[in-house]
């Protein structure tokens, strides 16, 4: 089951993933989208990273953190309530079947 | 201590190419990305790409694909920037800094004129 | 990519004036990764602030900076002559990285 994080309308929603990076310039690539992860990626696709930067991001999401050290946690600015719904955080580790997957329940009242 | 030296001024004509330099000293030169970042007389600055010489990755602007190639000589610790088809409006100051940005050559100047 | 838009561009103080700069991103970037350069005249720039608010070495404490999302700002709490500057916001979270404008900052 997923855990449930709660936002008001006209506020800021915060999600949090975090991981811990092997090295700093040797990052792991992060997607962000809304829906339940799927077997593999993201669908609905918000936001991603690379082995360095933020390289995808759509225009009320960002990284607030130090993403290049692990905090990825997803940011959502001036939240409707059309942004309820599940996000899926799906860190990608190298190798078959090795990701991460986080689902995230926004709730906004 | 840190440091980038970069090579000196650089007056070339239209249409022809230049490799510009960097050098960096007192730090492991594989271990850190190094960025190049172009400044016009009285303008703004734009970063051009970085390279990672631990791996020899790059990534550039959209904007200086096909303009701008980035190498290292690991060797050596230099960090290169080839510039081709040079027009007029590739005349600037060319920067290279370090891989969180808190390091910096004391920039290339290049004029393209015929 | 993620326009930074630097005001005002130019401006004028008199000493132990504060002066405050702004920088307004089009989309919201890691404050961890917006930073400040001081520029002089045929010199590089200088690293100011990095990650929104610590100041780099060297410089003075009357110097401050602000901000997350898509709003940032860098305040001089007293202008003193060897202020005056260019100044530029940068952001290096999103690919690809990209400078504000720059505000020139002269002395009165």
């Known amino acids: 089951s997923e855990v449930e994080y709660r936002a008001e309308v006209g506020q800021n929603a915060y999600l949090p993933c975090f991981y811990t990076p092997a090295a700093p310039g040797n990052l792991v690539p992060v997607c962000w989208g809304k829906g339940a992860c799927p077997v593999f990626e993201c669908g609905n696709v918000v936001l991603r990273t690379d082995e360095r930067d933020v390289n995808y991001w759509t225009s009320r999401y960002w990284l607030n953190g130090d993403f290049r050290k692990g905090d990825v946690s997803l940011t959502i600015e001036n939240v409707t309530l059309a942004d309820s719904g599940i996000y899926c955080c799906r860190i990608q580790f190298p190798g078959l079947m090795n990701d991460k997957k986080f689902n995230l329940k926004l709730v906004i009242k | 201590q840190i440091q980038l030296q970069q090579s000196g001024p650089e007056l070339v004509t239209p249409g022809t190419s230049v490799k510009i330099s960097c050098k960096a000293s007192?730090?492991?030169?594989?271990?850190?990305?190094i960025n190049w970042v172009k400044q016009r007389p009285g303008q703004g600055l734009e970063w051009i790409g970085w390279?990672?010489?631990?791996?020899?990755?790059?990534k550039y602007n959209e904007k200086f694909k096909g303009k701008a190639t980035l190498t290292v000589d690991t060797s050596s610790s230099i960090a290169y920037m080839h510039l081709s088809s040079l027009t007029s409006e590739d005349s600037a100051v060319y920067f290279c800094?370090?891989?969180?940005?808190?390091?910096w050559g004391q920039g290339t100047t290049l004029t393209v004129s015929s | 990519q993620i326009v930074l838009t630097q005001s005002p561009a130019i401006m004028s103080a008199s000493p132990g004036e504060k002066v405050t700069l702004t920088c307004s991103a089009s989309?919201?970037?890691?404050?961890?990764?917006l930073y400040w350069y001081q520029q002089k005249p045929g010199s590089s720039p200088k690293l100011w602030i990095y990650?929104?608010?610590n100041l780099a070495s060297g410089v003075p404490a009357r110097f401050s900076g602000s901000g997350s999302g898509t709003s940032y700002s860098l305040t001089i709490s007293n202008m003193e002559t060897e202020d005056a500057a260019s100044y530029f916001c940068?952001?290096?979270?999103?690919?690809?990285?990209?400078f504000g404008g720059g505000t020139k900052l002269e002395i009165k």
């Open positions: 390279i990672y010489p631990g791996s020899g990755n790059t």
């Open positions: 007192g730090y492991t030169f594989t271990d850190y990305y």
């Open positions: 989309s919201g970037v890691s404050s961890s990764y």
């Open positions: 940068h952001q290096w979270s999103n690919s690809p990285y990209t």
């Open positions: 990650s929104t608010s």
């Open positions: 800094a370090g891989d969180r940005f808190d390091y």
